[in-house]
Interface confidence: medium
């Protein structure tokens, strides 16, 4: 038997004999910004180099006694979780520790910034292989700490951080709220979000994924052969740092965007009991528990996509929300969601030379979310084609007319406050799969992409009587790039992608008095890349 | 006491090396902003990260920090530059009175200023 947390992150095919690929992160260096550590603990001896970096505030209280084992407790345990010889995730990874937290586990934003700068300077002086930086700490939202993380990420460093232990929206904390950082929440052996006293793991759209973070056995600084069980989002982040080290060791050329997409792709899906989260956060919180990939070989053939939710727009009439993809990702579709159903749709628009997804609130609405579908599509050339409101009874349509361009997503946006009920033909005319259809009073936007070997198809699931939720999923080998609803009438709250499933939510029929004529159809666009598949076959 | 003497010495040097006038006045229309932690108990007033505009060179960061010290000294305030950032973000970390924030926000090259705050092991 192995500890529950190591078993949980291990794909079934390893469980029989060795639980991980052999090299175990040996090409990767993991920086740990935390407390001091006991580097001669037998779990981490020879694996962790203690740098001379130290920037910590004075301990609080006049009667505080520095006790080495207590000062080293947090950092030693995390170093053990990342690379410990017996209880570590990436047993081959080498680590470097920087002391930014004092003996009470407290540090400062400025000390952390100086630590991040130290790492960047070390990287410039002596470039090594892939770098992972583990930040098992959290403070209040900090523009400067997030900016420093962004700069370091853009220099090719993978940053992994704790979501925070405040049972709160992770977007209110830093560095958890930095979009470039991989933010990790904590789950337990029952795949429940971790409760820590009266608080617990943070949640929300700023969390990328969850990982084991309760009752994690690791190195204890009490003695060199001691182990301790600790809990928290730090422990969860340490698991992901270890998994990242394993992935980067197998594929050292992976970019941050590629690594994040792989972490999401190989995670266990829909295993977390979402009832633990506040109701308004459930849809925003990823239901993903990190796991190692089932093979050390890359999954380059796969078309990887993820869903990115915007911040809430706020309730004013003209309020908008914007969801952005990472620099290396393509925005392949854009949708919107409003709990009240009062929204004016969404559109893809250029901002700073990159497409973003903008959702529009409606008068009397409580606010909207924009939902971007962000994908890794090398050599892609994407553009948005727009058709203004048709006013015709057949509804508005737009298609991809450029040679070799395929439809990856449909959006619709309207200026009127409330779209009347209107039933456009749900099935599009044969031979025209590259077409978006929408309400006659709406502008329709088609995301059209050209990429080597890219092929897409439209999949629909319509339910004659209105339902609170309609879903349609892409089959094995295909990736969901677009998710939208037909028709765009006011009882539709919106559409969003959850993993490979398109979810369309409608208002509770009992409260709206909707008629059975108002059918709702979930429209999924499923794509795959023959080019990527061929390339990976040639490599093997 | 020794520390304070060191600070005064540093300030006198800063004063001598700075001209009185505001050369390099802040660009028109761009207003630097001030940020602080929303969670009051985590705030660390008295220490500030002054973040400069993206393309600012190290020499300009040092010059801006010296200018802040000189202008603060003229108003009778003691300041201490704790660190000059370069490599990730241009800027500097300064220990000073919150009374000087308005002055600091008007310095050339300043993008925004953030009050230092606590972070915690999770």
């Amino acid at each position: 038997s192995i500890p529950w947390n190591l078993e949980r992150i291990t794909p079934p095919r390893y469980r029989a004999d060795e639980y991980q690929p052999p090299d175990g992160g040996s090409l990767v260096e993991v920086y740990l910004l935390d407390t001091s550590i006991q580097s001669d603990h037998r779990e981490i001896e020879g694996r962790v180099m203690v740098t001379d970096f130290e920037n910590v505030p004075e301990e609080d209280g006049t009667r505080f006694h520095r006790q080495a084992s207590k000062c080293d407790s947090h950092g030693t345990h995390l170093a053990g979780v990342v690379s410990g010889r017996d209880a570590g995730v990436a047993k081959g990874a080498s680590m470097r520790s920087l002391r930014v937290l004092n003996c009470q586990g407290k540090g400062t934003v400025s000390g952390t910034l100086i630590g991040l700068e130290f790492i960047r300077k070390s990287q410039l002086v002596q470039p090594v292989g892939p770098l992972v930086v583990l930040l098992p700490l959290a403070g209040g939202y900090s523009r400067v700490l997030n900016a420093a993380c962004q700069r370091l990420a853009r220099a090719g460093v993978v940053l992994v951080t704790a979501a925070g232990n405040f049972r709160d929206d992770a977007c209110l904390y830093s560095p958890a709220s930095a979009p470039e950082v991989i933010t990790v929440g904590a789950t337990n052996a029952q795949d429940q979000p971790v409760t820590l006293g009266t608080l617990g793991t943070n949640f929300g759209r700023c969390v990328d994924l969850f990982a084991p973070g309760e009752d994690i056995i690791g190195a204890s600084s009490d003695c060199s052969t001691c182990f301790v069980s600790q809990s928290g989002t730090s422990q969860a982040a340490a698991h992901v740092a270890g998994i990242a080290a394993m992935m980067l060791s197998a594929e050292p050329e992976l970019t941050l965007a590629e690594l994040r997409q792989r972490l999401i792709h190989f995670s266990a899906k829909d295993v977390i009991n979402e009832a633990w989260f506040p109701e308004d956060q459930r849809v925003l919180t990823p239901n993903l528990v990190a796991a190692l990939p089932p093979s050390t070989h890359g999954a380059g053939w796969q078309l990887f996509c993820r869903t990115v939710w915007s911040a809430h727009s706020g309730p004013t009439r003209m309020a908008t929300a914007i969801a952005r993809c990472a620099p290396d990702e393509e925005l392949l579709s854009c949708s919107s969601f409003s709990r009240s159903g009062k929204r004016r749709g969404e559109r893809m628009e250029a901002q700073g030379g990159k497409l973003v997804c903008r959702a529009h609130n409606a008068f009397g609405g409580e606010g909207v979310y924009a939902i971007a579908r962000c994908c890794l599509l090398p050599q892609a050339n994407c553009s948005v084609h727009t058709a203004p409101p048709a006013e015709a009874s057949m509804g508005t349509r737009v298609h991809c007319h450029q040679q070799g361009h395929v439809l990856t997503g449909c959006s619709s946006h309207w200026e009127v406050e409330d779209l009347g009920t209107h039933k456009p033909p749900v099935l599009r005319p044969r031979g025209q799969p590259n077409q978006c259809v929408g309400h006659r009073e709406a502008s329709i936007h088609a995301s059209c992409c050209h990429a080597p070997g890219l092929e897409c198809k439209v999949k629909e699931h319509g339910i004659p009587a209105p339902q609170e939720q309609v879903t349609v999923a892409c089959e094995e080998g295909w990736t969901l790039t677009g998710c939208s609803a037909l028709p765009g009438t006011s009882h539709v709250l919106g559409a969003y992608a959850v993993d490979n499933t398109c979810v369309v939510r409608s208002r509770d029929v009992s409260t709206t008095g909707s008629t059975s004529e108002e059918a709702v159809t979930a429209v999924a666009i499923c794509c795959r890349s023959r080019h990527l598949a061929q390339a990976s076959q040639e490599l093997q | 006491q020794e520390d304070e003497d060191g600070d005064y010495e540093e300030l006198v040097l800063a004063l001598r090396s700075e001209e009185d006038g505001l050369a390099e006045a802040p660009e028109h229309g761009t207003t630097a902003t001030f940020h602080r932690c929303a969670k009051d108990p985590w705030r660390l007033p008295g220490t500030y990260v002054v973040v400069l505009k993206e393309e600012t060179h190290l020499s300009q960061s040092e010059r801006t920090a010296r200018r802040l010290q000189a202008q603060a000294a003229r108003r009778g305030y003691l300041t201490k530059i704790l660190h000059v950032f370069h490599g990730l973000l241009p800027g500097f970390l300064v220990k000073m009175s919150g009374d000087l924030l308005e002055l600091a926000l008007k310095l050339p090259h300043v993008d925004y200023i953030e009050e230092d705050s606590s972070v915690f092991a999770q």
């Epitope: 038997s1 192995i2 500890p3 001669d40 037998r42 001896e45 207590k70 407790s73 017996d86 209880a87 056995i217 204890s220 009490d222 003695c223 060199s224 052969t225 001691c226 182990f227 301790v228 069980s229 600790q230 | -």
Partner: antibody
Framework: QVQLVQSGAEVKKPGSSVKVSCKAS????????ISWVRQAPGQGLEWMGG????????NYAQKFQGRVTITADESTSTAYMELSSLRSEDTAVYYC????????????????????????WGQGTLVTVSS | DIQMTQSPSSLSASVGDRVTITCRAS??????LNWYQQKPGKAPKLLIY???TLQSGVPSRFSGSGSGTDFTLTISSLQPEDFAVYYC????????FGQGTKVEIK
């Protein structure tokens, strides 16, 4: 007091494998807290590996990595040591020994001390490797 | 691996003598050291653990001291049943034993 009783002497050919068992009787026994130590004729003691009781993971000395497998069967209170690719220099007396694991509460957490302190030993099993 | 060096490798002594055996570690091991006694054809027997704590049932003439890299086993008054081989063993890293000290009758 725990008694550790080992299986009988074995004669093996070079290249083959041997599996020695160690059964506990009397007292409470954590079959995970077992190490194996060998002693070549006229030589000193050499630790081969053991099962880490806290993690339930076998831990092996560098020298034996890949050649030794240590397992434990809770239901029969028996630990096993299998050594493969035997060579003549593997001729030795093989001992199983119980090592210590202490668990104490600390700072609201459990700290586990893994101590390779061998208080109980089996009688030893002579393994002779000869062609 | 941590190397353990015992000295002397053998010694001759008489009943009633005070005998001292030393053990040096190749690096600091705190007080993570045990001492064992082994008689011919028998399994080793634990005498002292954690550098200086006497295992229950072991006569008080045996004592241990030291920490870091240098350790000592002392038999205050040698008895006839004490003639045997003595081993030190560290457990700060993976366990390693000293090469042994044979205590013979003079």
């Amino acid at each position: 007091q725990v008694q550790l009783v080992q299986s009988g002497a074995e004669v093996k050919k070079p290249g083959s494998s041997v599996k020695v068992s160690c059964k506990a009787s009397g007292g409470t026994f954590n079959s995970h807290a077992i190490s194996w130590v060998r002693q070549a004729p006229g030589q000193g003691l050499e630790w081969m590996g053991g099962i880490n009781p806290i993690l339930g993971i076998a831990n092996y000395a560098q020298k034996f990595q890949g050649r030794v497998t240590i397992t434990a069967d809770e239901s029969t209170s028996t630990a096993y040591m299998e050594l493969s690719s035997l060579r003549s220099e593997d001729t030795a007396v093989y001992y199983c020994a119980r090592h210590y694991e202490i668990q104490i509460g600390r700072y609201g957490m459990n700290v586990y001390y893994l101590m390779y302190r061998f208080a109980s030993w089996g009688q030893g099993t002579l393994v002779t490797v000869s062609s | 691996d941590i190397q353990m060096t015992q000295s002397p490798s053998s010694l001759s002594a008489s009943v009633g003598d005070r005998v001292t055996i030393t053990c040096r570690a190749s690096q600091g091991i705190r007080s993570a050291l045990n001492w064992y006694q082994q008689k011919p054809g028998k399994a080793p027997k634990l005498l002292i653990y954690n550098g200086s704590t006497l295992q229950s049932g072991v006569p008080s003439r045996f004592s241990g001291s030291g920490s870091g890299t240098d350790f000592t086993l002392t038999i205050s008054s040698l008895q006839p049943e004490d003639f045997a081989v003595y081993y030190c063993q560290q457990f700060d890293g993976d366990p390693t034993f000293g090469q042994g000290t044979k205590v013979e009758i003079k």
